[in-house]
């Protein structure tokens, strides 16, 4: 929802968290602001305090329940409001009718580990975190590998168009240090976006055996 020069963007992690960012040009200084969530069909409501992340933007996480509890469904709409204190009252700065399963951003994949490493290849696995059972297998992944002397931005993206929580990296250089990251996205939702990248997993390929042709 955009009000003049104000932008209010939120994502649902598919379980029990809605993360919001509010940005406003000519922002109000030293003012207390919060996000209030009011679902149309459920009994709970929730508030979080907006904290500055830059000169003109604030962020907060609405914690709806235990991390793995399913607090919203595809039938729900949540009214989200940015409220800022003006003297003794609260002023509505931004508002949106939020459809959680149209605005998904999952948590970054976790528990990355090297399953098997050789001179030229490495098998890596991971797990998804706090992802709704509603998706069943309707997820996709992107992965990237950082090679020596390159940046993450230069790393080619590998796309896994199905729920596959492992990858076999090929054509690697022996005895070389690499880093690996993966991210996940549900296929559902008009405004759904990629999760953050996972924490990088560092690994080293095995050295080529002496006297062997590699």
């Amino acid at each position: 929802a955009v009000n003049g020069t104000s932008q209010f963007t939120c994502f649902y992690n598919s379980r029990a968290n809605i993360s919001c960012v509010w940005s406003q040009d000519g922002a109000l200084q030293d003012t207390s602001c919060q996000v209030h969530a009011w679902p149309d069909r459920r009994r709970w409501n929730q508030t979080c305090e907006l904290l500055p992340v830059s000169q003109a933007s604030w962020a907060c996480n609405l914690i709806l329940g235990a991390p793995d509890s399913q607090k919203l469904t595809t039938v729900d709409i949540v009214t989200l409001r940015v409220l800022c204190r003006e003297g003794v009252r609260w002023r509505v700065m931004a508002i949106q009718d939020f459809k959680p399963f149209e605005n998904l951003r999952l948590m970054a994949p976790i528990s990355l580990q090297v399953v098997h490493v050789e001179t030229h290849r490495c098998n890596i696995s991971w797990e998804i975190s706090q992802a709704s059972h509603y998706f069943e297998r309707h997820l996709e992944f992107e992965a990237r590998t950082l090679s020596p002397g390159h940046t993450w931005e230069e790393a080619p993206l590998l796309t896994l168009k199905q729920k596959q929580e492992w990858i076999c990296l090929e054509t690697l250089t022996p005895d070389t240090q690499y880093e690996f990251q993966v991210r996940v996205k549900p296929l559902q939702g008009e405004f759904t976006t990629w999760s953050p990248w996972s924490q990088p997993l560092a690994f080293r390929t095995k050295p080529a055996a002496l006297g062997k042709d590699t």
């Epitope: 069909r41 399913q70 039938v75």
Partner: antibody, heavy 116, light 107 residues
Framework: QVQLVQSGAEVKKPGASVKVSCKAS????????ITWVRQAPGQGLEWMGD????????NYNEKFQGRVTLTVDTSISTAYMELSRLRSDDTVVYYC?????????WGQGTLVTVSS | DIQMTQSPSSLSASVGDRVTITCRAS??????LNWYQQKPEGTLKLLIY???GLHSGVPSRFSGSGSGTDFTLTISSLQPEDVATYYC?????????FGQGTKLEIK
């Protein structure tokens, strides 16, 4: 206290339409979904659809799609369920209910009899 | 559509008994399961919402549990006024669906 009061029993001919009303009081009418459920004599409960008075948004059970229309008049805090092309198997009790994490308050029910 | 199956369809118990009614969903509905009581005259009341939440004004002898596909309504000590038909209902997805009901009688 929250109350939902429905209109009285109706007798209709096959092919006709019926419009049942549900007057809400004791809460902010525009802030909660109103759902409609029906029950044939001696049978279970069947969800027909729901409406959000604040926006007029509706959801319908496909079984009744095209025959049922849900509306509201927010000025008098009243929801309506209209069922058209009535058949003998529409002889049931119709209930309205407020939705808030379950159907937390119910109307008393309206018996509609379809008979030639 | 999600099918809801209740068991038993009827039961008879004595005052003071512990009574259990089960409800099974045809697919995972997380905790989006509610229980209702319908008295013989037709009055409907919400007892339990979101699997285990006790609706206001409902006696504490009623409780709910479960997750995913299997759910239970328990009456810890049956009272004469509990004679009714009990329904489970999922509000995980449209169309909302109900179990076929469990008719509870006093021996």
């Amino acid at each position: 206290q929250v109350q939902l009061v429905q209109s009285g029993a109706e007798v209709k001919k096959p092919g006709a339409s019926v419009k049942v009303s549900c007057k809400a009081s004791g809460y902010t009418f525009t802030s909660h979904w109103i759902t409609w459920v029906r029950q044939a004599p001696g049978q279970g409960l069947e969800w027909m659809g729901d409406i959000y008075p604040g926006s007029g948004n509706t959801n319908y059970n496909e079984k009744f799609q095209g025959r049922v229309t849900l509306t509201v008049d927010t000025s008098i805090s009243t929801a309506y369920m209209e069922l058209s092309r009535l058949r003998s198997d529409d002889t049931v009790v119709y209930y309205c209910a407020r939705e808030r994490g379950g159907f937390d308050y119910w109307g008393q029910g309206t018996l509609v009899t379809v008979s030639s | 559509d999600i099918q809801m199956t209740q068991s038993p369809s009827s039961l008879s118990a004595s005052v003071g008994d512990r009574v259990t009614i089960t409800c099974r969903a045809s697919q995972d509905i997380s905790n989006f399961l509610n229980w209702y009581q319908q008295k013989p005259e037709g009055t409907l009341k919400l007892l339990i919402y979101y699997t285990s939440g006790l609706h206001s004004g409902v006696p504490s002898r009623f409780s709910g549990s479960g997750s995913g596909t299997d759910f239970t309504l328990t009456i810890s000590s049956l009272q004469p006024e509990d004679v009714a038909t009990y329904y489970c209902q999922q509000d995980n997805n449209h169309p909302y669906t109900f179990g076929q009901g469990t008719k509870l009688e006093i021996k």
